[in-house]
């Protein structure tokens, strides 16, 4: 009854520092409240990038100051992370928790390696 979470292995951020990927979970139960968290793993350190709790059938809402946005459809969440720079290149893990009703389930994806390349500055034109 473990919950499986799938996400793409690799994503390349756009030149504007935006990366999008789909996080899909196989729900073992009929959850009405789901929490989705994006974690970044660098070396052995794990940090939270953003998190949102949503009711099934409703929209996914991150905090106003979050660098993440997203939409949900059934057991699929479309995540977008913005404001990324080359130093943010790393492994981004999708974590899904079925919060309500009981029982609680935890699902952790294998991670999406996001590559971010800072755009070259435009040359001065004489």
């Amino acid at each position: 009854k473990a919950m499986h979470v799938a996400q793409p292995a690799v994503v390349l951020a756009s030149s504007r520092g935006i990366a999008s990927f789909v996080c899909e979970y196989a729900s073992p139960g009929k959850a009405t409240e789901v929490r989705v968290t994006v974690l970044r793993q660098a070396d052995s350190q794990v940090t939270e990038v953003c998190a949102a709790t949503y009711m099934m059938g409703n929209e996914l809402t991150f905090l106003d100051d979050s660098i993440c946005t997203g939409t949900s459809s059934g057991n699929q969440v479309n995540l977008t992370i913005q404001g990324l720079r080359a130093m943010d290149t790393g492994l981004y893990i999708c974590k899904v928790e079925l919060m309500y009703p009981p029982p609680y389930y935890l699902g952790i994806g294998n991670g999406t390696q996001i590559y971010v390349i800072d755009p070259e500055p435009c040359p001065d034109s004489d």
Epitope: K1, A2, M3, H4, P28, E33, R35, T37, L39, V46, T47, E48, A51, T53, K95, M99, Y100, P102, P103, Y104, Y105, L106, I108
Partner: antibody, heavy 118, light 108 residues
Framework: QVQLVESGGGVVQPGRSLRLSCAAS????????MHWVRQAPGKGLEWVAV????????YYADSVKGRFTISRDISKNTLYLQMNSLRAEDTAMYYC???????????WGQGTMVTVSS | EIVLTQSPGTLSLSPGERATLSCRAS???????LAWYQQKPGQAPRLLIY???SRATGIPDRFSGSGSGTDFTLTISRLEPEDFAVYYC?????????FGQGTKVEIK
């Protein structure tokens, strides 16, 4: 540094109540699920209760459901366990533990002993 | 509820020897949600391994975890004097969170 410190344990008579506290420091308290785990003398570990993030969701072991209430005060960075209708079998060392971002219990307090005896 | 059964109950070994501890689950547990803890007398448990095989911060590399499905193993490659303690496995993939009954590693 990251730390959890429990308090509030003691000797109490069966049927009475007790409130345990767990003061957290060194991390963003509201980003983590917080658990209570107990250990009867000479026995193994038993999970008791968890409270999530903003406190909206809580889960309990069947053995304490309806008698214990877990809560948290984010402004005080403190976790609580209100224990009512205590029984002799609730005698144990009570630990608070942080559920890390990947789910394991990575930080534990030193424990507070609760003895239920007449 | 997922029941975890640890074996053996007690392991009597000498420093320098290899310790192999087993944890068997009553139903399949994803390796992402299996942890091992060490507990010494009078102390709180300490996280050793999470995700079945990842060492927690500061844990020496003589500790390793492996396994999948229903069978998991904690191995201590060469026992140091400070490793004699009780070890617990735990699953945290679904509620209720459950622990094994523990394996005591004692000095022979």
């Amino acid at each position: 540094q990251v730390q959890l410190v429990e308090s509030g344990g003691g000797v109490v008579q069966p049927g009475r109540s007790l409130r345990l506290s767990c003061a957290a420091s060194g991390f963003t308290f509201s980003s983590y699920g917080m658990h209570w785990v107990r250990q009867a003398p000479g026995k193994g570990l038993e999970w008791v209760a968890v409270i999530w993030y903003d406190g909206s969701n809580r889960y309990y072991a069947d053995s304490v459901k309806g008698r214990f209430t877990i809560s948290r005060d984010i402004s005080k960075n403190t976790l609580y366990l209100q224990m009512n209708s205590l029984r002799a079998e609730d005698t144990a060392m009570y630990y608070c533990a942080r559920g890390d971002l990947l789910g394991a219990f990575d930080i534990w307090g030193q424990g507070t002993m609760v003895t239920v005896s007449s | 509820e997922i029941v975890l059964t640890q074996s053996p109950g007690t392991l009597s070994l000498s420093p320098g020897e290899r310790a192999t501890l087993s944890c068997r689950a009553s139903q399949s547990v994803s390796s992402s949600y299996l942890a091992w803890y060490q507990q010494k007398p009078g102390q709180a448990p300490r996280l050793l391994i999470y995700g079945a095989s990842s060492r927690a911060t500061g844990i020496p590399d003589r500790f390793s975890g492996s396994g999948s499905g229903t069978d998991f193993t904690l191995t201590i490659s060469r026992l140091e004097p400070e490793d004699f303690a009780v070890y617990y496995c735990q699953q945290y993939g679904s509620s209720p969170w459950t622990f094994g009954q523990g394996t005591k590693v004692e000095i022979k």
